[in-house]
């Protein structure tokens, strides 16, 4: 399954939107930094394309869920959020088209399920952090920075998969 060229453009637009969403000076938020334990090994180059697409799909779905909450709506600019949702939705569609084609359904399903579970647990840690920090502006900025980093790392994986073809 070949992801369209527009998919990587959409990924870059997503990162740009995340950068634009910033609302306060980040220098005041240093004390709120947190280790969310991004499961980097689940996005390693050792995986085949068949195995990574469902994991990438899970990653983007979880980002969508995180920023679709009422707490998120209160934290960010509504216009930017709407554009952000649109970009994520398009990327989910692109990845779903590959999943539907049955790519990787029979290949190492346990490895794939473990990776998906690791991504879900990562987002659970992010959600718990926000709750503990009472959804403060700094907590949201820390999460936004973390999502930019993890999304960027997963996007790099997509690019490396494309270049291997």
């Amino acid at each position: 399954c070949d992801l369209p060229q527009t998919h990587s453009l959409g990924s870059r637009r997503t990162l740009m939107l995340l950068a634009q969403m910033r609302r306060i000076s980040l220098f005041s938020c240093l004390k709120d930094r947190h280790d969310f334990g991004f499961p980097q090994e689940e996005f390693g180059n050792q995986f085949q394309k068949a195995e990574t697409i469902p994991v990438l799909h899970e990653m983007i779905q979880q980002i969508f869920n995180l920023f679709s909450t009422k707490d998120s709506s209160a934290a960010w600019d509504e216009t930017l959020l709407d554009k952000f949702y649109t970009e994520l939705y398009q990327q989910l569609n692109d990845l779903e088209a590959c999943v539907i084609q049955g790519v990787g359904v029979t290949e190492t399903p346990l490895m794939k399920e473990d990776s998906i579970l690791a991504v879900r647990k990562y987002f659970q840690r992010i959600t718990l952090y926000l709750k503990e920090k009472k959804y403060s502006p700094c907590a949201w900025e820390v999460v936004r920075a973390e999502i930019m980093r993890s999304f960027s790392l997963s996007t790099n994986l997509q690019e490396s998969l494309r270049s291997k073809e």
Epitope: L26, L30, R33, F36, A145, R149
Partner: antibody, heavy 121, light 107 residues
Framework: EVQLVQSGAEVKKPGESLKISCKGS????????IGWVRQMPGKGLEWMGI????????AYSPSFQGQVTISADKSISTAYLQWSSLKASDTAMYYC??????????????WGQGTLVTVSS | DIQMTQSPSSLSASVGDRVTITCRAS??????LNWYQQKPGKAPKLLIY???SLQSGVPSRFSGSGSGTDFTLTISSLQPEDFATYYC?????????FGQGTKVEIK
């Protein structure tokens, strides 16, 4: 390979202006902040200030506020430290270093080689 | 500003010795503390971040501990290349501040 390359040594007279640079390569320049550190001859490290190159937001140590200006040009992945009127007491080695911002990652993990600034009449 | 105080300011030790340097913050900094090594004429090098995390490529003889206001850098068995000046730095709030440094010299 991540690198921060600083401009060469400078010899200036009191009252002159100066702008030194720090060019980042091998990583996404806007994903990290750039900090500046002073080390006077035979002395310890002093933190001067920091810049977020993604939007040029800056913060200074009170000791250096109004004495220096930190800027960045993200189009050429370069941060700057400048003086409008140098004093003899500005004679020091100046280092730039990258910082991961709000991300959980090693602070100041890569440093420039340093720029020696000598101010003498 | 948060003040960082290192002790001792200098120490003499022999190759193979266990060396301990302490750093005290004027207020709680949780675990937001870094340790750097600097050799003459060179840029500082990050050894430990977040109080106890070993930076990639740094030998395991270096370790860090502590939280709140009191922190320690330990070199388990001093090597010839470890003779240098060591600095702690708080990373919880701006302005970031460094300790005054500890010079480790050959006995």
């Amino acid at each position: 390979e991540v690198q921060l390359v600083q401009s060469g040594a400078e010899v200036k007279k009191p009252g002159e202006s100066l702008k030194i640079s720090c060019k980042g390569s091998g990583y996404s320049f806007t994903s990290y902040w750039i900090g500046w550190v002073r080390q006077m001859p035979g002395k310890g490290l002093e933190w001067m200030g920091i810049i977020d190159p993604s939007d040029s937001d800056t913060a200074y140590s009170p000791s250096f506020q109004g004495q220096v200006t930190i800027s960045a040009d993200k189009s050429i992945s370069t941060a700057y430290l400048q003086w409008s009127s140098l004093k003899a007491s500005d004679t020091a080695m100046y280092y730039c270093a990258r910082h991961p911002g709000l991300n959980w990652a090693p602070d100041f993990d890569y440093w420039g080689q340093g720029t020696l600034v000598t101010v003498s009449s | 500003d948060i003040q960082m105080t290192q002790s001792p300011s200098s120490l003499s030790a022999s190759v193979g010795d266990r060396v301990t340097i302490t750093c005290r913050a004027s207020q709680s900094i949780n675990r937001f503390l870094n340790w750097y090594q600097q050799k003459p004429g060179k840029a500082p090098k990050l050894l430990i971040y977040a109080a106890s995390s070993l930076q990639s490529g740094v030998p395991s003889r270096f370790s860090g501990s502590g939280s709140g206001t009191d922190f320690t850098l330990t070199i388990s068995s001093l090597q010839p290349e470890d003779f240098a000046t060591y600095y702690c730095q708080q990373a919880i709030d701006l302005p970031f501040t460094f300790g005054q440094g500890t010079k480790v010299e050959i006995k």
